[in-house]
Amino acid sequence: IWELKKDVYVVELDWYPDAPGEMVVLTCDTPEEDGITWTLDQSSEVLGSGKTLTIQVKEFGDAGQYTCHKGGEVLSHSLLLLHKKEDGIWSTDILKDQKEPKNKTFLRCEAKNYSGRFTCWWLTTISTDLTFSVKSSRGSSDPQGVTCGAATLSAERVRGDNKEYEYSVECQEDSACPAAEESLPIEVMVDAVHKLKYENYTSSFFIRDIIKPDPPKNLQLKPLKNSRQVEVSWEYPDTWSTPHSYFSLTFCVQVQGKSKREKKDRVFTDKTSATVICRKNASISVRAQDRYYSSSWSEWASVPCS
């Protein structure tokens, strides 16, 4: 048993038929010694008396809010949550496996630049009686500070008969050094509680591996005289790290016809302009990627040819 926060405790249970469970001793937080009784949740049934209560926790019926009273007055509460381990593996019932980039990916994180700021998100079909809290650090044995805001509900989607909820959190490394080579990964830990079930989820990554630039900005076309060619120009996104001479991007320029079946013409360049042939009803799109490290491409920025 361990304390998640004040008066909230997690009991770790091996979950199999006829498992013996865990013996837990609860202590009433009071200077009183006599006349103390214990109840669970809203029940008025007295479970025991005295300053301590010993219980055998085997199932969710044994979890909940234990309250000690004296003469009708509430003295203190202890909320017991269960963390299930089945066949040596902690349960992951609350969050949805996003399966990207691999199976058992419950948390996904992205950074727009090397400032040490990043966003993580997760999905669930559960909405009621649900709590998420997030902690983060760089390294785990001698952790360096990363500050995360409170998690937020960031999207609701209907998926068939189910509603899917996306939650996200923004974090910032306290003493980020954008130009430094990372040697210790960032660790993100999400505590999830649904009703009386506790689970925790972790993700470990280097900022360089989760970089995804914003799309190029100010995408413009300039027709070239007496030619079907156009000069496409764009700028680095505002959110990208500076100086651009050091934090350089490479770009992919694509000409795409109206029909998805039409052949796409692609040009790769380190410059912020390119010359391409603009076909009727086509559109021109540009995306960006870190020039020196193959992390994710940005989303496309697009303009019509006409």
Partner: nanobody, 122 residues
Framework: EVQLVESGGGLVQAGASLRLSCAAS????????MGWLRQAPGKEREFVAT????????YYADSVKGRFTISRDNAKNTVYLQMNSLKPEDTAVYYC???????????????WGQGTQVTVSS
């Protein structure tokens, strides 16, 4: 730390509206997710609604969805609960609460106000 003071409760007829306010003191208000919770006599405290620190997507208990609206004004350090089409079963003490977590559970809020009584008569 954040201190919370609710106001706006009262006695109304079924079908009427009320607007609760919660004034927060402390510069950190804008970093907390805020919630409204309620407790009817002899019942457990129950979750009503929550709004995130960035005033993003609010979330409501099914029992109040479509009738209640939670909002916040970070410039005024205030969170609101607009309650329309009130029913007798909405009678309770309403609490404003703050959390560093996202929670649709009454159990995981860190800071609580003293509460304001809402009574809906039929």
């Amino acid at each position: 730390e954040v201190q919370l003071v609710e106001s706006g409760g009262g006695l109304v007829q079924a079908g009427a509206s009320l607007r609760l306010s919660c004034a927060a003191s402390g510069r950190t208000f804008r970093s907390y997710n805020m919630g409204w919770l309620r407790q009817a006599p002899g019942k457990e405290r129950e979750f009503v609604a929550t709004i995130s620190w960035n005033a993003g997507i609010p979330y409501y208990a099914d029992s109040v969805k479509g009738r209640f609206t939670i909002s916040r004004d970070n410039a005024k350090n205030t969170v609101y609960l607009q309650m329309n089409s009130l029913k007798p079963e909405d009678t309770a003490v309403y609490y404003c609460a703050a959390s560093n977590s996202w929670s649709s559970s009454a159990r995981f809020y860190d800071y609580w106000g003293q509460g304001t009584q809402v009574t809906v008569s039929s």
